[in-house]
Amino acid sequence: FPQDRPFEDTCHGNPSHYYDKAVRRCCYRCPMGLFPTQQCPQRPTDCRKQCEPDYYLDEADRCTACVTCSRDDLVEKTPCAWNSSRVCECRPGMFCSTSAVNSCARCFFHSVCPAGMIVKFPGTAQKNTVCEPASPGVSPACASPENCKEPSSGTIPQAKPTPVSPATSSASTMPVRGGTRLAQEAASKLTRAPDSPSSVGRPSSDPGLSPTQPCPEGSGDCRKQCEPDYYLDEAGRCTACVSCSRDDLVEKTPCAWNSSRTCECRPGMICATSATNSCARCVPYPICAAETVTKPQDMAEKDTTFEAPPLGTQPDCNPTPENGEAPASTSPTQSLLVDSQASKTLPIPTSAPVALSSTGK
């Protein structure tokens, strides 16, 4: 590439840059443990931490668990990406009555329009079916005087949605204002539309929240409460508690009304990559044999491998990094030749063996 030589020369002697023949440009070399956000990084901001699978890098640069859509009434809308959470929505035929961050805390079946009513707007994952009278200006046959009451101005009658609660509440009851519960009425009975200013027999006016006990009239002492396995975050949103279901995690503190469950590595393991309220990667305490050094990054994925340490050095069996912080997360696809964390202190002589890392491929 003689025509590229002037450009290539600008990279020589600068260890923080390299010349990419494919793009014919000088590129910034991301530091260890960070990965490029573009093919030819130009500056440090083009390099980011990469989280473990099923974690994403949030706005605060923390590895945060992606929400799971494992409940029967949820489906994945968008997948877990390196910089955004998985997003779940109610499965077809249902709508969300209680939203949660990147998910839905409570889904209900779409209403079936009763006799004399037709669908005006079909139900979606976010909204219930909206019904209207079959013939404009003609009221449906009234089974009782109460059923003939006109809805308040600007609202459209709807059949009552059927709740599918992810946890404790019985499917035949619904939380209603004031904390009491009513038996679900027959589907043919009409209630006001969800955004009607006053309506009995629908979820609490605060989406996703219901009082923990009936509130005395005029009392402001009603604590809002989310669905099971969700907690009320600082912003007043129902947020999914992290799960400790991975084999290498144990529950440290339970999911509470106002705080997430917290997980920690099970006994005999330490956290190599921290995550919000959990640990993204647990590794066994290093067991260092003479003249070998454990590669912690590979432990969770395959048999332990050992490498000869550089000449004149002793294996570092200290389970925590020198600065006391967990090392930056590295790619879930692992390093090619030298583990990016181990290599912070273990540059390998050219003659030393190096291993292409692979997960059972």
Epitope: D20, F35, T37, S331, L337, S357
Partner: nanobody, 123 residues
């Protein structure tokens, strides 16, 4: 000093096969992607194939799909390119490259390069 050394090139008849090797040595950090490029005489550099070394995911240029196979041998720190049903248009210098997978994409950086090995397909 990082070294990527290609071998296995040579003269082969159309329809024949060759297996290229790329031996990696030295200190390559954070790398999780290796690939092959080629440059035909008087032409620009063309991407051929790459492998994401942790997941084993492989990718190929349309021009070689179904004929070339990329693989890796962890124990020997070696990348391979098995080339079958070779054509005259496959004649080129083949380069090995190593780098990192770009976040949120399926492309890679190319931070380290070999010197290349010549493949000539001719009758």
């Amino acid at each position: 000093e990082v070294q990527l050394v290609e071998s296995g090139g040579g003269l082969v008849q159309p329809g024949g096969s060759l297996r290229l090797s790329c031996a990696a040595s030295g200190y390559i950090y954070s790398s999780n992607c290796m690939g092959w490029f080629r440059q035909a005489p008087g032409k620009g550099l063309e991407w051929v194939s790459r492998i994401h070394t942790g997941s084993g995911s492989t990718y190929y240029a349309d021009s070689v799909k179904g004929r070339f196979t990329i693989s890796q041998d962890n124990s020997k720190n070696t990348l391979y390119l098995q080339m079958n049903s070779l054509r005259a248009e496959d004649t080129a210098v083949y380069y090995c490259a190593a780098g990192r997978v770009v976040l949120g994409a399926v492309v890679c950086t190319n931070e380290y390069w070999g010197q290349g090995t010549l493949v000539t397909v001719s009758s």
